[in-house]
Amino acid sequence: VPRWRQQWSGPGTTKRFPETVLARCVKYTEIHPEMRHVDCQSVWDAFKGAFISKHPCNITEEDYQPLMKLGTQTVPCNKILLWSRIKDLAHQFTQVQRDMFTLEDTLLGYLADDLTWCGEFNTSKINYQSCPDWRKDCSNNPVSVFWKTVSRRFAEAACDVVHVMLNGSRSKIFDKNSTFGSVEVHNLQPEKVQTLEAWVIHGGREDSRDLCQDPTIKELESIISKRNIQFSCKNIYRPDKFLQCVKNPEDSSCTSEI
């Protein structure tokens, strides 16, 4: 008799999830010699232990603490790049500007990037059929709690000038409900962070508006200022040229505004 299984609204666990996480851990330790002390088997066991046999709507940050401990990593606190709704460009940037880091450039972020996972209460099985959707089912699901946990820790570690890349093509350039707006903004430490500098990325080629004057950016400035952190904002009118100039800063066309 087939066992009844909870149907959730979101997609199920990414296929070959255990192998993918293990493979990413191996690759990360290969690329980052300073992380060769990390035992990838222990990392996988801790990752799995955070959600296996637990109700996927009842996951807590505490469940992920063993994994957090194993994945402890020191990144230069003044080289942190946060992003909201513009992940690909942020990652392209840190691939060129190798001394800056997004969350996904750290081990834990790298392991989980673009993956979905969940288990079932009282069984050791991974649910490949469906997982809870943040809106339709529950917010305390394995994926959301993971990202909330690692994002909070990442923001807490930041110091000096913190940069954030924001998508100027969206109706809400700054969204209070995004991970950046709901977690990272509130976990920057005013005693360590001097300035939050927003880079607003323009989408249209002929878009010459000053998106730093957008109401949602003003809202971000207000939140940040109230937390005793300075705020600055720059328009990136030509993201393609911006990346090109990061690659080749000596290029003569890179002296003008981008």
Epitope: P18, E19, L22, A23, C25, V26, K27, T29, E30, R36, H37, V38, D39, C40, Q41, S42, W44, D45, K48, S124
Partner: nanobody, 122 residues
Framework: EVQLLESGGGLVQPGGSLRLSCAAS????????MSWVRQAPGKGLEWVSG????????YYADSVKGRFIISRDNSKNTLDLQMNSLRADDTAVYYC???????????????RGQGTLVTVSS
């Protein structure tokens, strides 16, 4: 190119001991989990023992638990298998294998060596 070269096999009497070694090259040894697998004459492959990339975690098949000891030296890129209290049913070709690790009973293997023959007979 990945190379896994096993050595140390041979003929040994029941109850005797043997130490197998595997020299690895062509990849970042310290990032990979390693295993020993074996194939007895006319039989399928059997996973024997494994060790995580740092050596913190070790695993054994029930059939060899308490008799075999796996170890690695990441500074020398070597994997060893100390086999004690050998029995006739341990006779097999022993292969060194590199991989990503384990999930439960599943071993995610990437590469395997050519093997070394262990014969346990009086």
């Amino acid at each position: 190119e990945v190379q896994l070269l096993e050595s140390g096999g041979g003929l040994v009497q029941p109850g005797g001991s043997l130490r197998l070694s595997c020299a690895a090259s062509g990849f970042t040894f310290s990032s990979y989990a390693m295993s020993w697998v074996r194939q007895a004459p006319g039989k399928g492959l059997e996973w024997v023992s494994g060790i995580s990339n740092t050596g913190i975690n070790t695993y054994y098949a029930d059939s060899v638990k308490g008799r075999f000891i796996i170890s690695r030296d990441n500074s020398k890129n070597t994997l060893d298998l100390q086999m004690n209290s050998l029995r006739a049913d341990d006779t097999a070709v022993y292969y060194c294998a590199s991989g990503k690790g384990w999930d439960g009973n599943t071993w995610y293997e990437d590469y395997r060596g050519q093997g070394t023959l262990v014969t346990v007979s009086s």
